[in-house]
């Protein structure tokens, strides 16, 4: 069960996680950024590599608003999607449109989430309701996982990787804003 039991309207249901790195910087103008991440050292020969760490896959960054019932996040969140075929790291293109994706003829390597992070989002609700907040789990990094014919889809959920726990910082508690201010911001957000 774990976090999976938290069923969020506009957020993918994500299995429970360990710890997370710092969130990626928020994108400013809703542009999607695609980049191929290098997942390890280059292989000795592109078709002989056997070590998962020698494979890499693409991490796509994009921004979206989180919705919760009639409410919507005040700001978009930056989300990461694990995409594409895994291949030897040195053969992957640096950006979309440069180079060709390598397709393995042997074992199947799948690009799957590796680490997650939880991000608090402030929700703006219509009608001047009290400000509400929600925590969403977002993919923080991707990895290649080697699948054998004995693996099935459920075994892709291998997300127990631990990252350093971020320092617990305290910030002053934001005061509840007036209904008018809340409503105005909601209208502006749309």
């Amino acid at each position: 069960q774990g976090w999976q039991a938290f069923k969020n309207d506009a957020t993918e249901i994500i299995p429970e996680l360990g710890e997370y790195p710092e969130p990626p910087p928020e994108l400013e103008n809703n542009k999607t950024m695609n980049r191929a991440e290098n997942g390890g050292r280059p292989p000795h020969h592109p078709f002989e590599t056997k070590d998962v760490s020698e494979y890499s896959c693409r991490e796509l960054h994009f921004t979206r608003y989180v919705t919760d019932g009639p409410c919507r996040s005040a700001k978009p969140v930056t989300e990461l999607v694990c995409s594409g075929q895994c291949g030897p790291a040195r053969l992957l293109p640096n950006a979309i449109g440069r180079g060709k994706w390598w397709r393995p003829s042997g074992p199947d390597f799948r690009c799957i989430p590796d680490r997650y992070r939880a991000q608090r989002v402030q929700l703006l609700c219509p009608g001047g309701e009290a400000p509400r907040a929600r925590k969403v789990r977002l993919v923080a990094s991707c990895k290649c996982k080697r699948l054998t014919r004995f693996h099935n889809q459920s075994e892709l959920k291998d997300f127990g990787t631990e990252a350093a726990r971020p320092q617990k910082g305290r910030k002053p508690r934001p005061r509840a804003r007036s209904a008018k201010a809340n409503q105005a911001e909601l209208e502006n957000a749309y």
Epitope: Q1, P70, A118, R120, A133, K135, K168, G169, R173
Partner: antibody, heavy 118, light 107 residues
Framework: QVQLVQSGAEVKKPGASVKVSCKVS????????QHWVRQAPGKGLEWMGW????????EYASKFQGRVTMTEDTSTDTAYMELSSLRSEDTAVYYC???????????WGQGTTVTVSS | DIQMTQSPSSLSASVGDRVTITCKAS??????VAWYQQKPGKAPKLLIY???RLLSGVPSRFSGSGSGTDFTLTISSLQPEDFATYYC?????????FGGGTKVEIK
């Protein structure tokens, strides 16, 4: 498996304080909001407040403001609720609950009975 | 504070019956209402939030409706495990408040 395990029953004198603990397992407490709800014998539910363990943010019901303190230890994934200046009407079962929002209570502890009696 | 008034406070019904519980808010709470089920000696369990959204794993015989000040929880065909006390909760404005509860008993 998500589990919230609360500390045992307490008997307190009027004017004293009580501190109830709630150990969360199944996910890191810092990724949740922690809520406290109480229920007097034979009565309904009463929301006391919530806290965000990650940043120490809190929201308390005005009725308990100044008497309640909600804290967490993220290293042990344990939440605490301390209620001071106890009176007989504070006799109740105190529940911790957790969720991904500040407004709904997805998982609950088993409850801790606090009896205030002279 | 927003008052949530539930009715009836108790009702007797048989297995298979259709049961309706109502909750009236003292002011407009939009759709910010949740419903909980509580069995004797146990902690409450979340069933529905945002008036009509069923929590994952909750049987589809439970449904919620309403908006503004009037809300309804319906159990389309009462099952033996549904005999319990049901509470509505508003989260439109602080402090979050619960209704007084409706006890569903076996007839």
């Amino acid at each position: 498996q998500v589990q919230l395990v609360q500390s045992g029953a307490e008997v307190k004198k009027p004017g004293a304080s009580v501190k109830v603990s709630c150990k969360v397992s199944g996910f890191p407490i810092k990724d949740t909001f922690q809520h406290w709800v109480r229920q007097a014998p034979g009565k309904g539910l009463e929301w006391m407040g919530w806290s965000d363990p990650e940043i120490g943010d809190t929201e308390y019901a005005s009725k308990f403001q100044g008497r309640v303190t909600m804290t967490e230890d993220t290293s042990t994934d344990t939440a605490y609720m301390e209620l001071s200046s106890l009176r007989s009407e504070d006799t109740a079962v105190y529940y911790c609950a957790t969720g991904d929002t500040t407004y709904k209570f997805d998982f609950w502890g088993q409850g801790t009975t606090v009896t205030v009696s002279s | 504070d927003i008052q949530m008034t539930q009715s009836p406070s108790s009702l007797s019904a048989s297995v298979g019956d259709r049961v309706t519980i109502t909750c009236k808010a003292s002011q407009d709470v939009h759709t910010a209402v949740a419903w909980y089920q509580q069995k004797p000696g146990k902690a409450p369990k979340l069933l529905i939030y945002y008036t009509s959204r069923l929590l994952s794993g909750v049987p589809s015989r439970f449904s919620g409706s309403g908006s503004g000040t009037d809300f309804t929880l319906t159990i389309s065909s009462l099952q033996p495990e549904d005999f319990a006390t049901y509470y509505c909760q508003q989260y439109s404005d602080y402090p979050w408040t619960f209704g007084g509860g409706t006890k569903v008993e076996i007839k």
